[in-house]
């Protein structure tokens, strides 16, 4: 018996608007109806919670209103989008999945997605 497997891409480049999307897929050992997904960021030996959502299978992911994350779910796959990213937010983003209900509880953690964020160059002033 091992920890629940969670897969996520190794690297993602954020868009020029500071948006990064990636898929978090988990191999569910049972038929979970309630799942909690948490995105963690590890950088410079610090770990912070970026966002978290609990959802019922078949329903939409609901993050808090002020969350920088949005997402959709399809079966054992969660499509996550993080917005408002800046260069200083570059780091390893880890998908943590917990099968909350029904018992037994399972925990899985992905190997992390390195998100690179490059701040756009400011547009030069035009002289007319």
């Amino acid at each position: 018996c091992k920890a629940m497997h969670v897969a996520q891409p190794a690297v993602v480049l954020a868009s020029s608007r500071g948006i990064a999307s990636f898929v978090c897929e988990y191999a569910s050992p049972g038929k979970a109806t309630e799942v909690r997904v948490t995105v963690l960021r590890q950088a410079d030996s610090q770990v912070t919670e970026v966002c978290a959502a609990t959802y019922m299978m078949g329903n939409e992911l609901t993050f808090l209103d002020d969350s920088i994350c949005t997402g959709t779910s399809s079966g054992n796959q969660v499509n996550l989008t993080i917005q408002g990213l800046r260069a200083m937010d570059t780091g390893l983003y880890i998908c943590k999945v917990e099968l909350m209900y029904p018992p037994p509880y399972y925990l899985g953690i992905g190997n992390g997605t390195q998100i690179y964020v490059i701040d756009p160059e400011p547009c030069p002033d035009s002289d007319f």
Partner: nanobody, 127 residues
């Protein structure tokens, strides 16, 4: 799935010792980091120590006083607590995290990575 049960809490005088045990069932401990955490009244849950196959890590406040160890053959993890102080009074929890390649000595004990939390055992240091 992993199930953890801890034991060994109690009342001890300052300067005394206690050993907490965390027993795992349903899985081998091998692919997991096992951590001890504590929570004092009105405070956040904090890391005490954790251990994987080859490394241990401790909170600064317990270094040199507490020792974490594991016995994979018995599926047990232990926390030996010596030179106990009043500020060590708290509810102590055992938890598990899948061991990951990106864990560092500084992050492998981070509570965000853990699950399978136990109910907690009370440790009270008082004369």
């Amino acid at each position: 799935e992993v199930q953890l049960v801890e034991s060994g809490g109690g009342l001890v005088q300052p300067g005394g010792s206690l050993r907490l045990s965390c027993a795992a069932s349903g899985s081998t401990l091998d692919p997991f980091v096992i951590g001890w955490f504590r929570q004092a009244p009105g405070k956040e849950r904090e890391t005490v120590a954790c251990i994987n196959r080859s490394r241990t890590s401790y909170a600064d406040s317990v270094k040199g006083r507490f020792t974490i160890s594991r016995d994979n053959s018995k599926n047990m993890v232990y926390l030996q607590m010596n030179s106990l102080r009043a500020e060590d009074t708290a509810v102590y929890y055992c938890a598990a995290s899948p061991d990951k390649p990106f864990y560092t000595d500084q992050t492998m004990c981070n509570k965000h990575y853990y699950g399978y939390w136990t109910q907690g055992t009370q440790v009270t240091v008082s004369s």
